[in-house]
């Protein structure tokens, strides 16, 4: 069952998942100047059975000359959101190690993919938070959020994390300075 909303936003922090539960959707988003091809699903889906899961549908982006019909209040320069290729590659290598029943690994990047991945998570999904570069984590508990179903409604638990200004970035569970990650699993790509 899909979570009704997105994981909580923590100031100066991003989140990511170890692996994605079956039923998770990843929107086929393209970078500026490109758009999703007209034939093909608007999203990839983590699907399969208890022994093997994989992403159904493939995202494809094509060049676009569409005129802009959105009034943008402040420009969002591409460089602000640019994802580092080397960072992506190392994250993909980590993701390759993940093999959880009923879960999918981080899907590989597609050509002209947008800089931010938009996921629709399902109940039971856990995401892990880390402070962005230049901020340090102060923990009051686990830096994670779980989508739970309560009385027919979905909600995300509140991660116990505060990010304060400092030079050293904190680490995701499974990286150089592990922080209470279940089974010490490596992480996949940032989804915020």
């Amino acid at each position: 069952e899909l979570c009704d909303d997105d994981p909580p936003k923590i100031t100066h922090a991003t989140f990511k998942a170890v692996a994605y539960k079956e039923g998770t959707m990843l929107n086929c988003e393209c970078k500026r100047g490109f758009r999703r091809i007209k034939s093909g699903s608007p999203y990839m889906l983590c699907t399969g059975n208890s022994s093997h899961s994989s992403w159904d549908n493939q995202c494809q982006c094509t060049s676009s000359a569409a005129r802009n019909t959105t009034k943008q209040v402040t420009p969002q320069p591409e460089e602000q959101k640019e994802r580092k290729t080397t960072e992506m590659q190392s994250q993909m290598q980590l993701a390759d190690q993940v093999s959880l029943p009923g879960h999918c690994r981080e899907p590989p990047p597609w050509e002209n993919e947008a800089t931010e991945r938009i996921y629709h998570f399902v109940v039971g999904q856990t995401v892990y938070y880390q402070c962005v570069q230049g901020y340090r984590a102060l923990h009051r508990g686990p830096a994670e959020s779980v989508c739970k179903m309560t009385h027919g409604k979905t909600r995300w638990t509140q991660p116990q994390l505060i990010c304060t200004g400092e030079t050293e970035p904190s680490q995701f569970p499974g990286e150089e300075e592990p922080q209470a990650s279940p089974d010490g699993l490596p992480e996949s790509e940032t989804s915020r």
Epitope: N27, S41, Y43, L45, T47, T70
Partner: antibody, heavy 114, light 107 residues
């Protein structure tokens, strides 16, 4: 809580235009496509088109090209649809929808009458 | 355009029964099919995405199945509140298209 709030009913003259709005709340407006769907009694549901507020990209059902114009304003998290050269065939309920059709507005009833 | 055909416009059932609403696509749409429920005077409500995955809050008596061209929405243990019209939709390619709808009547 995710909500799509649509503007109120419209009674309009044939040959004129009408603009309806869909205000999104409870999620990041620029991340998700907003679609528009037409419903007429006996005609089921018809997909008109969609718009990506983050990039301004639009897709239209060929049938509605020249009839519908989709726009979005990121400052107010509002998507608009304008229908032009109205005829009785345009009398219908129009829904906006988002997050891969998971959420629907309450609909805007448009009545075209002389 | 891909045509989605719901051959039964009306279906009659009783509380506690099991009923299956079918939908046929004019060409292969993979599993890119959704099901919606619309009660009189209300907006459509999303029930199923990707042919078989339930949205949150949808009772587990609603089950979707199928792939390719043939799809089914099954309601087991029908309740009086299931009185509604049910639509299928393909989003495999533009333009997205809906089935004509199947009205479920409770005897």
């Amino acid at each position: 809580q995710i909500q799509l709030q649509q503007s109120g009913a419209e009674l309009v003259r044939p040959g004129t235009s009408v603009k309806m709005s869909c205000k999104a709340a409870g999620y990041t407006f620029t991340n998700y496509w907003i679609g528009w769907v037409k419903q007429r009694p006996g005609h089921g549901l018809e997909w008109i088109g969609d718009i990506h507020p983050g990039g301004g990209y639009t897709n239209y059902n060929e049938k509605f090209k020249g009839k519908a114009t989709l726009t979005a304003d990121t400052s107010s998290s509002t998507a608009d649809m304008q229908l032009s050269s109205l005829t009785s065939e345009d009398s219908a309920i129009y829904y906006c929808t988002s997050r891969n059709f998971a959420y629907w507005g309450q609909g805007t009833l448009v009545t075209v009458s002389a | 355009d891909i045509v989605m055909t719901q051959s039964q416009k009306f279906m009659s059932t009783s509380v506690g029964d099991r009923v299956s609403v079918t939908c046929k696509a004019s060409q292969n749409v993979g599993i890119n099919v959704a099901w919606y429920q619309q009660k009189p005077g209300q907006s459509p409500k999303a029930l199923i995405y990707s042919a078989s995955y339930r949205y949150s809050g949808v009772p587990d008596r609603f089950t979707g199945s199928g792939s390719g061209t043939d799809f089914t929405l099954t309601i087991s243990n029908v309740q009086s509140e299931d009185l509604a019209e049910y639509f299928c939709q393909q989003y495999n390619s533009y333009p997205y298209t809906f089935g004509g709808g199947t009205k479920l009547e409770i005897k």
